[in-house]
């Protein structure tokens, strides 16, 4: 058993049918010695008396808010949560496996640049009695500071019969140098509590591996005289790291017909312009990627050919 | 990435082309190592990230873009020792910091070259003959060093009398390649920045 926060405790249980559970001793936070009784949640049934209460915690029915009273007055509370260990592996009931980029990915994180700011998000089908708390650091043995905000509900989607809820959090490394070569990964830890169930999820990454630039901005077409060709031009996104001559991007320009089946023409360039043939009803799209370290491509920025 | 590559015109900053070749070569070598050594811990998540140049060179600090010198987090350990400029610089444009930056890059390359050559000698003794260093990568390191043209003491190749532990050598190869790829990215950024300046 360990303390999650003041008056909230997590009991770790080896979770299998007929398991013996864990013996837990609760102590009433009071100078009083006599006439103390204990109850669980809203029930008035007295579970025991005395300054300490010994309980055998086996199932969720044994978890909850234990209260010690004296003469009708509440003295203190202890909330017991359960953390299930199923065959040597901590349970992951609360969050959905996003399966991207690999199986058992519960937290996904992205950064728009090298400033040390990043966003993580996760999915759940649970809509109520759910709280999250996020901590982060650079490295784990001698951790350096990363400050995270509060997790917020960022999207709701309908998937088949289920509603899916997306939560996200923004974090910022306290003293980040965009040019630094990372040798210690960022660690992100999310505590999730649903009703009386506690779970924790972690992700470990280098900022360089989670970079996904914003799409190029100011995408424009300039028709070339007496030709079906157009000059496409664009600019680096505002959110990208500067100077751009150091933090360079590479670009992919795509000409896509109206039908998805039509052949796509693609050109790769390090410049911020390209000359392409603009077909009728086609659209031109451009996306960006770090020129030197192949992390994710940005989303496409698009303009119609007409 | 197998993308079309524009060849730099002769008037360009001479080292940019070499540094691009270097990044391509080390990335290819790392990919090959990860595939060949699939039963070894060779992914970024599995290895310890060690930098053999730590406390010996200070490339990131010495080559910091001017715009980032205002960022206190980037200014932990700026080097101040003076080193003669190399041939990548048009001499009139030579600045003290630029010379320092390029000499630091040269020292990095020299250290990695020695490590890779020592390692290759061990890998050639492996009865499994599982993996060797790409000669193209070693050649590209050499080319960039020559382009930088710094006069520096030659570091003798390390020789070891004891029987090599091939498992450990292959893991060390992965660690070295990961670190060298990160350094090659920094070198490429620096060359691109200097070229634009």
């Amino acid at each position: 058993i360990w303390e999650l926060k003041k008056d909230v405790y997590v009991v770790e249980l080896d979770w299998y049918p007929d398991a013996p559970g864990e013996m837990v001793v609760l102590t009433c936070d009071t100078p009083e010695e006599d006439g103390i009784t204990w109850t669980l949640d809203q029930s008035s049934e007295v579970l025991g008396s005395g300054k300490t209460l010994t309980i055998q915690v086996k199932e969720f029915g044994d978890a909850g808010q234990y209260t010690c009273h004296k003469g009708g007055e509440v003295l203190s509370h202890s909330l017991l949560l359960l953390h299930k260990k199923e065959d040597g592996i901590w349970s992951t009931d609360i969050l959905k496996d996003q399966k991207e980029p690999k199986n058992k990915t519960f937290l996904r994180c992205e950064a728009k640049n090298y400033s040390g700011r990043f966003t993580c998000w996760w999915l759940t089908t649970i809509s109520t009695d759910l709280t999250f708390s996020v901590k982060s650091s650079r490295g784990s043995s001698d951790p350096q500071g990363v400050t995270c905000g509060a997790a917020t509900l960022s999207a709701e989607r309908v998937r088949g019969d289920n509603k899916e809820y997306e939560y996200s959090v923004e974090c910022q490394e306290d003293s980040a140098c965009p040019a630094a070569e990372e040798s210690l990964p960022i660690e992100v830890m999310v505590d999730a509590v649903h009703k009386l169930k506690y779970e924790n999820y972690t992700s470990s990454f280098f900022i360089r591996d989670i970079i996904k630039p914003d799409p190029p901005k100011n995408l424009q077409l300039k028709p070339l005289k007496n030709s079906r060709q157009v000059e496409v031009s664009w600019e680096y996104p505002d959110t990208w790291s500067t100077p751009h001559s150091y933090f360079s991007l590479t670009f992919c320009v795509q000409v896509q017909g109206k039908s998805k089946r039509e052949k796509k023409d693609r050109v790769f360039t390090d410049k911020t312009s390209a000359t392409v043939i603009c077909r009728k009803n086609a659209s031109i799209s451009v996306r960006a990627q770090d020129r030197y370290y192949s992390s994710s491509w940005s989303e496409w920025a698009s303009v119609p050919c007409s | 990435r197998n993308l079309p590559v524009a060849t730099p015109d002769p008037g360009m900053f001479p080292c940019l082309h070499h540094s691009q070749n270097l990044l391509r070569a080390v990335s290819n070598m790392l990919q090959k190592a990860r595939q060949t050594l699939e039963f070894y811990p060779c992914t970024s998540e599995e290895i310890d990230h060690e930098d053999i140049t730590k406390d010996k060179t200070s490339t990131v600090e010495a080559c910091l873009p001017l715009e980032l010198t205002k960022n206190e987090s980037c200014l932990n350990s700026r080097e101040t020792s003076f080193i003669t400029n190399g041939s990548c610089l048009a001499s009139r444009k030579t600045s003290f910091m630029m010379a320092l930056c390029l000499s630091s890059i040269y020292e990095d390359l020299k250290m990695y070259q020695v490590e890779f050559k020592t390692m290759n000698a061990k890998l050639l003794m492996d009865p499994k003959r599982q993996i060797f260093l790409d000669q193209n990568m070693l050649a590209v390191i050499d080319e960039l060093m020559q382009a930088l043209n710094f006069n520096s003491e030659t570091v003798p190749q390390k020789s070891s009398l004891e029987e090599p532990d091939f498992y450990k050598t292959k893991i060390k190869l992965c660690i070295l390649l990961h670190a060298f790829r990160i350094r090659a990215v920094t070198i490429d950024r620096v060359m691109s920045y200097l070229n634009a300046s």
Epitope: Y16, A19, K85 | -
Partner: antibody, heavy 115, light 112 residues
Framework: QVQLVQSGGGVVQPGRSLRLSCAAS????????MHWVRQAPGKGLEWVAF????????YYADSVKGRFTISRDNSKNTLYLQMKSLRAEDTAVYYC????????WGQGTMVTVSS | SYVLTQPPSVSGTPGQRVTISCSGG????????VKWYQQLPGTAPKLLIY???QRPSGVPDRFSGSKSGTSASLAITGVQAEDEADYYC????????????FGTGTKVTVLG
């Protein structure tokens, strides 16, 4: 004490369907994940499928994906395996099993797929 | 499709020490715990070892398990006639959990 009693096995022709049941008692069935494991005659153990305690997630072996469906009725304390498009290579003793460091197995039920 | 490899058979005379190996990889045994089962003819498997080296109550202390790196082993010190059975190791793969990975199985024969 924990008990898992299986039923529903038998002889069936290739291409036909069969449903296996596993009735649980002696524990809070709705709190635990459950597996199906099979063993072809004279062969080793092969995992077939898993279902979470609340039925929200199901996992299958590639060899049965799209043909077998694992389900549970927590109000009846029963686990099911619906098997469709059966093949000769599905012939085996099928076991249900609880998920956890200490597990409990059903007695097994024989499924024979033969024309 | 078995990823955990066991010797097909091992044998010993009563009182001898018998060991069964179970060889896997970094994504399974290397990053998960190992169980061992005993299966007597015509019966369901019985748990002998969980969590690499833990014995459930009721399992004789002549059975012991260990794990090192990407392989595990089961030892029977002072093998007895009633130990003649098939033995299976089981683990998980970190990418496909909770799918169970079973070993190929080992037939233990007690001679004499």
């Amino acid at each position: 004490q924990v008990q898992l009693v299986q039923s529903g096995g038998g002889v069936v022709q290739p291409g036909r369907s069969l449903r296996l049941s596993c009735a649980a008692s002696g524990f809070t069935f709705s709190s635990y994940g459950m597996h199906w494991v099979r063993q072809a005659p004279g062969k080793g153990l092969e995992w077939v499928a898993f279902i979470r305690y609340d039925g929200s997630n199901k996992y299958y072996a590639d060899s049965v994906k799209g043909r077998f469906t694992i389900s549970r009725d927590n109000s009846k304390n029963t686990l099911y395996l619906q098997m469709k498009s059966l093949r000769a290579e599905d012939t085996a003793v099928y076991y249900c099993k609880t998920h956890g460091s200490h597990d409990n197995w059903g007695q097994g039920t024989m499924v024979t797929v033969s024309s | 499709s078995y990823v955990l490899t066991q010797p097909p058979s091992v044998s010993g005379t009563p009182g001898q020490r018998v060991t069964i190996s179970c060889s896997g990889g970094r994504s399974n045994i290397g990053s998960s715990t190992v169980k061992w089962y005993q299966q007597l003819p015509g019966t369901a498997p019985k748990l002998l070892i969980y969590g690499n080296d833990q014995r459930p109550s009721g399992v004789p202390d002549r059975f012991s398990g260990s794990k090192s790196g990407t392989s595990a082993s089961l030892a029977i010190t002072g093998v007895q006639a009633e130990d003649e059975a098939d033995y299976y190791c089981q683990s998980y793969d970190r990418g496909t959990h909770p799918a169970l990975l079973f070993g190929t199985g080992t037939k233990v024969t007690v001679l004499g």
